[in-house]
Interface confidence: low
């Protein structure tokens, strides 16, 4: 009968040897066998599992010149880089007729200093602010134990006392380097060394002193920044859409921001240069050397109106026996809110200044006193929105009116006999 | 095997500053453990005074931290003690060690009698 | 700083014997106290780390035991090279601190 065909007689005249070596070795199992008849496949397991996709080599050398002669058959399976999934008990594996040969087994090991599975991660955080750290290392050997240091001193004794996979770190006031040391019986691992930058908190109540038109002087309460003092703070201002979309939380307003620094102390900005009575949002982040804070969610503010800077424009007054038509331009100046009409002043060289509230018109034919025959008669104009009247208008002297010029039609305004209330002319 | 050698001056005068170097060979001072000079003085009293770590941050006695500062060369696989403004009182034999990573020193140099004298 | 007494500071034996040194730390260092063999014309020895642990390749007649602040060496079946100079160390913080020294004598 052709050898190894019998159950009690293997055909395995070698069986694979043991490894045991770190992480990244390269190394070889090999089994031999002699077989009467064509070759068989020599397949591997580990830990009795078929190796579908193992790296081995099949070398078959015939003992004499017949093919139903014996052969010595080699196979040789090659470990490149030894990882932890590659341990186990390997076995060659041959089906010859219809029996199955199992080799007896060789062992794989994974024997060195520790492995990093996670190591601490650079970050930054706000000063006295509690954070965690990670770090996880593995065997073989086991156990494995972590040791914390920070700024290259120990936070515990020895490794396996103090925190293991996750260090808890209750705030620091500077910034520090994190890295932890994994032991075995083969020796020490250290992690990379990470380092934690220390910010400045974020600013806490962020709010208006006062209001101006044009600007806006704004407050705030800076945060810790451990032993770095803060250099400067920074406050930017957007014009807030109709939406308001700019919300706690949402990303950043699509605009570019207006910018400002701020010296500090104190902590407090004149932020100028703005629109009236516009809707703005603002926040402030602080720096220190480390780096600045995390801004403050948006405020949102408002500058308050404020009277026109220039007079109405083009004024016209023209006269025709007892009425005088009066028309006149929205001032080209800018409003600064929302105009909310105009007011009219005229008086003659010897009678009491007259004055009017026109609202909104920017056209008036008033009905003057006695027979017309008043002289040197001038009208001024001056804008007002909800903050008060913007400047008046130079006198405009009353012309006559002559034929053919256009007069539109219009609402007469007929003035009482005592004046309701009298500015002074200036 | 892991050696430490001490050398430096025998006598050093008051008020000066004593300069002491630790040559290690067998292991890389930047690789793993702290370095340590620890002295002995007579009547055999030990005293620890410092180490570099090898990432090249330093730990010293309190007793000792405004005179005192560990260096290195890592080129060389040298570290460094300076302590300024000797006195009498620190005529003693200087060693210096390497920290086991359970943090006691598995290694230590002969030693180096330093007196401080006039 | 943590203060460590060792006592005796001086011991007369002889080969063959078992003897005990002692040290006491002013406060609690856990188990960290190491032992040191210190002989003329040889580097310092590092016997035991962390109360009990033995150093490699040092001579299992060497022990160590106590925590918290009483800490015993042992060494049983004096060997005439044992008779030396030992010290303690605590290493449990810093500044690491040592025991007095023990001087081991042949009786």
């Known amino acids: 009968a052709p050898r190894g065909t019998q159950a009690e007689e293997s055909p395995f005249v070698g069986n694979p040897g043991n490894i045991t070596g770190a992480r990244g070795l390269t190394g070889t199992l090999r089994c031999q066998l002699q077989v009467q008849g064509e070759p068989p496949e020599v397949h591997w397991l580990r830990d009795g599992q078929i190796l579908e996709l193992a790296d081995s080599t099949q070398t078959q050398v015939p003992l004499g010149e017949d093919e139903q002669d014996d052969w010595i058959v080699v196979s040789q399976l090659r470990i490149t880089s030894l990882q932890l999934s590659d341990t186990g008990q390997y076995q060659c594996l041959v089906f010859l007729g219809h029996q199955t040969f199992v080799s007896q087994p060789g062992y794989v090991g994974l024997e060195g200093l520790p492995y990093f599975l996670e190591e601490p991660e650079d970050r930054t955080v706000a000063a006295n602010t509690p954070f965690n750290l990670s770090c996880q290392a593995q065997g073989p050997p086991e156990p494995v134990d972590l040791l914390w240091l920070q700024d290259a001193v120990p936070l515990a004794t020895a490794p396996g006392h103090g925190p293991q996979r996750s260090l808890h770190v209750p705030g620091l006031n500077k910034t520090s380097s994190f890295s932890c040391e994994a032991h075995n019986a083969k020796g020490v691992t250290t992690s990379r060394t990470a380092t934690i930058t220390v910010l400045p908190q974020q600013p806490r109540n962020l709010h208006l002193v006062s209001r101006q038109p044009t600007e806006l002087e704004v407050a705030w309460t800076p945060g810790l920044s451990g032993i770095y003092p803060l250099t400067h703070c920074t406050l930017q201002a957007v014009l807030s859409d109709d939406g308001m979309g700019i919300q706690a939380g949402e990303p950043d307003p699509p605009e570019e921001p207006l910018t400002s620094q701020a010296s500090v102390p104190p902590h407090q900005l004149r932020l100028g240069s703005l629109h009236p009575h516009t809707p703005y949002h603002i926040r402030v982040a602080c720096t220190s050397s480390q780096g600045p804070s995390s801004w403050t969610h948006w405020l949102p503010v408002e500058t308050p109106e404020g009277v026109p800077l220039g007079p109405p424009e083009n004024i016209s007054a023209t006269r025709n026996g007892s009425q005088a038509f009066v028309h006149w331009q929205e001032p080209r100046a800018p409003l600064q809110g929302t105009l909310l009409g105009y007011r009219l002043a005229y008086q003659g060289q010897d009678t009491p200044e007259v004055l009017m509230d026109i609202g909104l018109r920017q056209e008036v034919t008033l009905e003057l006193q006695g027979d017309g025959s008043v002289s040197n008669l001038t009208v001024c104009v001056a804008a007002y929105t909800a903050a008060g009247d913007g400047p008046w208008s130079l006198p405009v002297p009353l012309e006559a009116w002559r034929p053919g010029q256009a007069q539109p039609v219009h609402q007469l305004v007929k003035e009482p006999s005592t004046p309701a209330f009298s500015w002074p002319w200036w | 095997d892991v050696q430490l050698q001490e050398s430096g001056p025998d006598l050093v005068k008051p008020s000066q500053s004593l300069s002491l170097t630790c040559t290690v060979t067998?292991?890389?001072?930047?690789?793993?453990?702290?370095w340590h000079w620890i002295r002995q003085f007579p009547g055999n009293k030990l005293e620890w005074m410092g180490y570099?770590?090898?990432?090249?941050?330093?730990n010293y006695n309190p007793s000792l931290k405004s005179r005192i500062s560990i260096t290195r060369d890592t080129s060389k696989n040298q570290f460094f003690l300076q302590l300024s403004s000797v006195t009498t009182e620190d005529t003693a034999t200087y060693y210096c060690?390497?920290?086991?990573?359970?943090?006691?020193?598995?290694?230590w140099g002969q030693g180096t009698s330093v007196t401080v004298s006039s | 700083d943590v203060q460590i007494t060792q006592s005796p500071s001086y011991l007369a034996a002889s080969p063959g014997e078992t003897i005990t040194i002692k040290c006491r730390a002013s406060k609690s260092i856990s188990k960290y106290l190491a032992w040191y063999q210190e002989k003329p014309g040889k580097t310092n020895k590092l016997l035991i780390y962390?109360?009990?642990t033995l150093h490699s390749g040092i001579p299992s007649r060497f022990s160590g035991s106590g925590s918290g602040t009483d800490f015993t060496l042992t060494i049983s079946s004096l060997e005439p090279e044992d008779f030396a100079m030992y010290y303690c160390q605590q290493h449990n913080e810093y500044p690491w601190t040592f025991g007095g020294g023990t001087k081991l004598e042949i009786k």
């Open positions: 962390s109360g009990s």
């Open positions: 570099i770590h090898y990432s090249g941050s330093t």
């Open positions: 067998g292991y890389s001072i930047t690789s793993a453990y702290s």
């Open positions: 060690a390497r920290s086991l990573w359970f943090y006691a020193m598995d290694y």
